[in-house]
C-alpha cells in the first residue's frame, strides 16, 4: 500500500462510486486532441483523485490528466488513435477503478456555429446554412448534423432536422405565419469515428411573414 | 537518438543581451512538445526560463517575462533564447530541454553553456 | 507561484545506505512532478516522472511516491555513482518550479 490509508480515507474511498465518463475532441487546437473526464456522481470527494491514462500512445507510456474544479484533462498531440488506452482512477499509487477506452468511440465534436436563417421571397423559403470547424479537420470529417426549430411559444416541441451537409431548406408553409422561431444545430460523429452529440450552437431567431391577403401568400419581414 | 546542443557567447556585457542557441537532432522542434530553457546561477539551483511549443507558442516564467524572447528557425530545427539588459544576476550555466506541456518531466537535456556577465 | 521545499539541502550516507529525500509543495499538484540527477558540471538527468514512475534507463534502486503535496524520493542502497544533487520539479502550474536541492555526500 503507499501509505495514504493511515486516516482511513482509503478505506473509506472503496466505498464510493467511482464511475466516470470521458469524451474525446480531436485537432481541437491545432494538432492538438483533448480528453475530458468526470465522475458521474457529482458528490464524490475529489480533493486527492486523479486521473491517467496508460496505453496507445505516442512516445509515451502514460499522461496524467489536469484538474480545473470538477473536470480532469489533458490536452496533447500523443493519442495513437489505434486501439484502447486504459484510464483510471488514481488515489496515491492506487488505482481505484480503470476503464478500457477506444478514444475514437468516446468524440464529442465542436458545437457549429454562425447559424443563420435567410428567407427568399420567390422561393417562398427559409435557407438555413451553418458552419463547422470539422470540415477543415483531418479525423472527424463526417457529421451528422441536427437542426432543430420550435415557435418560439412552444416551449418543448422542437421540430429535428438531420442531415450531413451544412445547408438546409424550410419551406414557408410548414411554419406558423407572422411567428417567431428559434433554432440551433448541433454534430455528431457520423463515420468510423464515434461518440456524443456536440454542445448545441448558439440559438438563431428569426420571423416568419405574414400571409399576403390577396395571393394568400406571407409578407416577407 | 534526440540530442541538444547549446551554442553562443560566453560572456556577454551588463545592459546587453545575451543570445543562445539551441540545436536539436534526432527529432524535430515542429513535431511535439515544449522546448525551454532552464538555467543554474553558480553554485545554486535550477530555474525554469521558458519555452517554445511545437506549434510555435511561447510561455516565460513571469520573473523574466519583459526580458525573453525565445523564437525559432525551423529550417534548422533549432530554438534561440534572447534575454535583454543583463545584469551580473544572469551569470549562469543555460541549458536547453525537452519536455514539459503535457508531460511532466525534461528527458532530454543540452550539456549546458556557462554565460559570464561582466564588464 | 507554487514553492517546491525540498529536505534536507544534504546529507552524507555510506554506500548500501538507503536515501530518502522529500520534497513539499506549497498547494496540490496531483502527480505533476520530477526528480532529477545533476552531478558537478554536468545536466541534470531525469530519474522518476509523474511523481512515481521510473524513467527509461534508471536503475530500480531508486523510487519515487507521493501525490498531491507531499513527494519522496528513494535510493534503495546507495551507490558510489549515486553520489550527486537530487532536485524535484513541478509541472503543475506555470512557473514551472524546482526545489533546492538535495547533495548527497560520502560520509
Known amino acids: 500500500e503507499s501509505g495514504y490509508a493511515q486516516n482511513g480515507d482509503l478505506e473509506d474511498a472503496e466505498l464510493d462510486d467511482y464511475s466516470f465518463s470521458c469524451y474525446s475532441q480531436l485537432e481541437v487546437n491545432g494538432s492538438q486532441h483533448s480528453l475530458t473526464c468526470a465522475f458521474e456522481d457529482p458528490d464524490v470527494n475529489i480533493t486527492n483523485l486523479e486521473f491517467e491514462i496508460c496505453g496507445a500512445l505516442v512516445e509515451v507510456k502514460c499522461l496524467n490528466f489536469r484538474k480545473l474544479q470538477e473536470i480532469y484533462f489533458i490536452e496533447t498531440k500523443k493519442f495513437l488513435l489505434i486501439g484502447k488506452s486504459n484510464i483510471c482512477v488514481k488515489v496515491g499509487e492506487k488505482s481505484l477503478t480503470c476503464k478500457k477506452i477506444d478514444l475514437t468511440t468516446i468524440v464529442k465534436p465542436e458545437a457549429p456555429f454562425d447559424l443563420s436563417v435567410v428567407y427568399r421571397e420567390g422561393a417562398n423559403d427559409f435557407v438555413v446554412t451553418f458552419n463547422t470547424s470539422h470540415l477543415q479537420k483531418k479525423y472527424v470529417k463526417v457529421l451528422m448534423h441536427d437542426v432543430a426549430y420550435r415557435q418560439e411559444k412552444d416551449e418543448n416541441k422542437w421540430t429535428h432536422v438531420n442531415l450531413s451537409s451544412t445547408k438546409l431548406t424550410l419551406l414557408q408553409r410548414k411554419l406558423q405565419p407572422a411567428a417567431m422561431y428559434e433554432i440551433k444545430v448541433r454534430s455528431i460523429p457520423d463515420h468510423y469515428f464515434k461518440g456524443f452529440w456536440s454542445e448545441w450552437s448558439p440559438s438563431y431567431y428569426f420571423r416568419t411573414p405574414e400571409i399576403n391577403n390577396s395571393s394568400g401568400e406571407m409578407d416577407p419581414i | 537518438q534526440v540530442q541538444l546542443q547549446e551554442s553562443g557567447p560566453g560572456l556577454v556585457k551588463p545592459s546587453e543581451t545575451l543570445s543562445l542557441t539551441c540545436t536539436v537532432s534526432g527529432y524535430s522542434v515542429t513535431t511535439d512538445y515544449a522546448w525551454n530553457w532552464i538555467r543554474q546561477p553558480p553554485g545554486k539551483g535550477l530555474e525554469w526560463i521558458g519555452y517554445?511549443?511545437?506549434?510555435?507558442?511561447?510561455t516565460y516564467t513571469p520573473s523574466l517575462k519583459s526580458r525573453i524572447t525565445i523564437s525559432r528557425d525551423t529550417s534548422k530545427n533549432q530554438f534561440s533564447l534572447k534575454l535583454s539588459s543583463v545584469t551580473a544576476a544572469d551569470t549562469a550555466v543555460y541549458y536547453c530541454a525537452r519536455g514539459g506541456y503535457d508531460v511532466n518531466y525534461f528527458d532530454y537535456w543540452g550539456q549546458g553553456t556557462t554565460v559570464t556577465v561582466s564588464s | 507561484d507554487i514553492q517546491m521545499l525540498q529536505s534536507p539541502s544534504s546529507l552524507s550516507a555510506s554506500v548500501g545506505d538507503r536515501v530518502t529525500i522529500t520534497c513539499l509543495a506549497s498547494?496540490?499538484?496531483?502527480?505533476?512532478l520530477a526528480w532529477y540527477q545533476q552531478k558537478p558540471g554536468k545536466a541534470p538527468k531525469l530519474l522518476i516522472y509523474a511523481a512515481t514512475r521510473l524513467a527509461d534507463g534508471v536503475p530500480s534502486r531508486f523510487s519515487g511516491s507521493g501525490s498531491g503535496t507531499m513527494f519522496t524520493l528513494t535510493i534503495s542502497s546507495l551507490q558510489p555513482e549515486d553520489f550527486a544533487t537530487y532536485y524535484c520539479q513541478q509541472f503543475f502550474s506555470y512557473p514551472w518550479t524546482f526545489g533546492g536541492g538535495t547533495k548527497v555526500e560520502i560520509k
Open positions: 498547494q496540490t499538484i496531483g502527480y505533476w
Open positions: 517554445i511549443f511545437y506549434s510555435g507558442s511561447t
